[in-house]
């Protein structure tokens, strides 16, 4: 795991208004783990960053981002309606300068160094789920979630109208 | 236009049972999680009960004061959430108001008109 | 349960001055960062109507003079400059726990 001292110092101050043009509403240093307790963790090899999703020792730190909170409108053709109303959007870095990515192409996440305003594919749409949880929508692919697959975070495409267990598209933050 | 209409209110005798139906039209019904909110003749809001998505198994949650005795359902295929309450009482007498969440599930946005629940002998 | 609580329970005031709507709760409806903590206006007849969301963010078609503020546990409405159709009860609800509680409402009139 890397960038946990350096993340502790991750001031708001690191995160100016230039994204997108807007600033956060508010902004949130935390832990992110899956709906059954693993760790998602951010390893530099080969001079990129991977993301596991894997149970930590017990004493073992660990890794924080810090998720940046923003209102957006919801477009109309997503939603099915014209007057959603606003709802939460999050970036969720890890370390300065590094965003995760949504790689539609690939249905993968990544994490890459990126100048601001950030793109797109490192939005997305933040849902309320029970059992203290979110999910993370890709702004870019409506339908779209993170979630996770053979111990990786993966893009998972989810039908609301199916039957499915979706626990894998279940994250929990904590700021322990 | 977004909607949502409730039906199937009136007068019902104490230990008696009534079926709320709640039509919507205007969205795409399946990908929101729906509620029941009721509020009592010259008093405040209460929530009720929420039912969520297929794909959250249709997951369902209750005020205390109406668990057991009511239950909350949707038929997608209908754009239509029910709300049955059985074993009524007369502090259940009140408007009974359909309502949607946000996309992302933050608040409640659209709300039907009320229809009037009266347990009375 | 958590107990919201507001005050005042009624408030009158002049045309074009500021009032202002207090929401406790009996504890923090803090989580992820954020509180879950929404402003509902209902007008006599109406079905309510969202304003304020997490705390601060204010619903969409809603007028600037509508503002949130608060953490935690306490929570305050503003209207800045009361216009005649702002006659309303305004409510407080946390979202954060199951049952989602509102509070018992502030009834808002012009002096």
């Known amino acids: 795991a890397f960038g946990i001292s350096g993340v502790q110092k991750y001031t708001r101050a690191l995160h100016d208004s230039s994204i997108t043009g807007i600033s956060p509403i508010t902004e949130y240093l935390a832990s992110l783990s899956t709906y059954n307790d693993q760790s998602i963790t951010f390893a530099l090899e080969d001079e990129s960053y991977e993301i596991y999703v894997e149970d930590l020792k017990k004493d073992e730190k660990k890794d924080k981002v810090l998720l940046s909170y923003y209102e957006s409108q919801h477009p109309s053709n997503e939603s099915g309606d014209g007057v959603d109303g606003k709802m939460l959007m999050v970036t969720l870095s890890p370390t300065k300068d590094f965003w995760l990515h949504a790689n539609n192409k690939e249905h993968s996440v990544e994490l890459h160094k990126c100048e601001k305003p950030l793109p797109d594919q490192a939005f997305f749409v933040l849902h309320n789920m029970h059992s203290n949880c979110v999910s993370f929508e890709c702004k870019t692919d409506p339908g779209v979630f993170i979630g996770v697959k053979d111990n990786h975070l993966a893009l998972i495409k989810v039908d609301s109208s199916e039957n499915l267990c979706t626990e894998n598209i279940l994250f929990k933050l904590s700021e322990t | 236009e977004v909607q949502l209409v409730e039906s199937g209110g009136g007068l019902v005798q104490p230990g008696g049972s009534l079926r709320l139906s709640c039509a919507a039209s205007?969205?795409?019904?399946?990908?929101?999680?729906m509620n029941w909110v009721r509020q009592a003749p010259g008093k405040g809001l209460e929530w009720m009960a929420e039912i969520t998505l297929k794909f959250n198994n249709y997951a369902t949650h209750y005020a205390e004061s109406v668990k057991g005795r009511f239950t909350i359902s949707r038929d997608d295929s209908k754009n239509t959430v029910y709300l049955q309450m059985n074993s009524l009482r007369a502090e259940d007498t009140a408007v009974y108001y359909c309502?949607?969440?946000?996309?992302?599930?933050?608040?409640?946005?659209?709300w039907g008109q009320g229809t009037l629940v009266t347990v009375s002998s | 349960d958590i107990v919201m609580t507001q005050s005042p329970d009624s408030l009158a005031v002049s045309l074009g001055e500021r009032a202002t709507i207090n929401c406790r709760a009996s504890e923090s409806v803090d989580k992820f960062g954020m509180s879950f903590l929404n402003w509902y206006q209902q007008k006599p007849g109406q079905p309510p109507k969202l304003l304020i969301f997490v705390a601060s963010s204010q619903g969409s078609g809603v007028p600037d003079r509508f503002s949130g503020s608060g953490s935690g546990t306490d929570f305050t409405l503003t209207i800045s400059s009361l216009q005649a159709e702002d006659v309303a009860v305004y409510y407080c609800?946390?979202?954060?726990?199951?049952?989602?509680?509102f509070g018992q409402g502030t009834k808002v009139e012009i002096k």
């Open positions: 609800q946390q979202s954060k726990d199951i049952p989602y509680t």
């Open positions: 309502a949607r969440r946000n996309y992302g599930n933050w608040y409640i946005n659209v």
């Open positions: 205007g969205f795409t019904f399946s990908n929101y999680w």
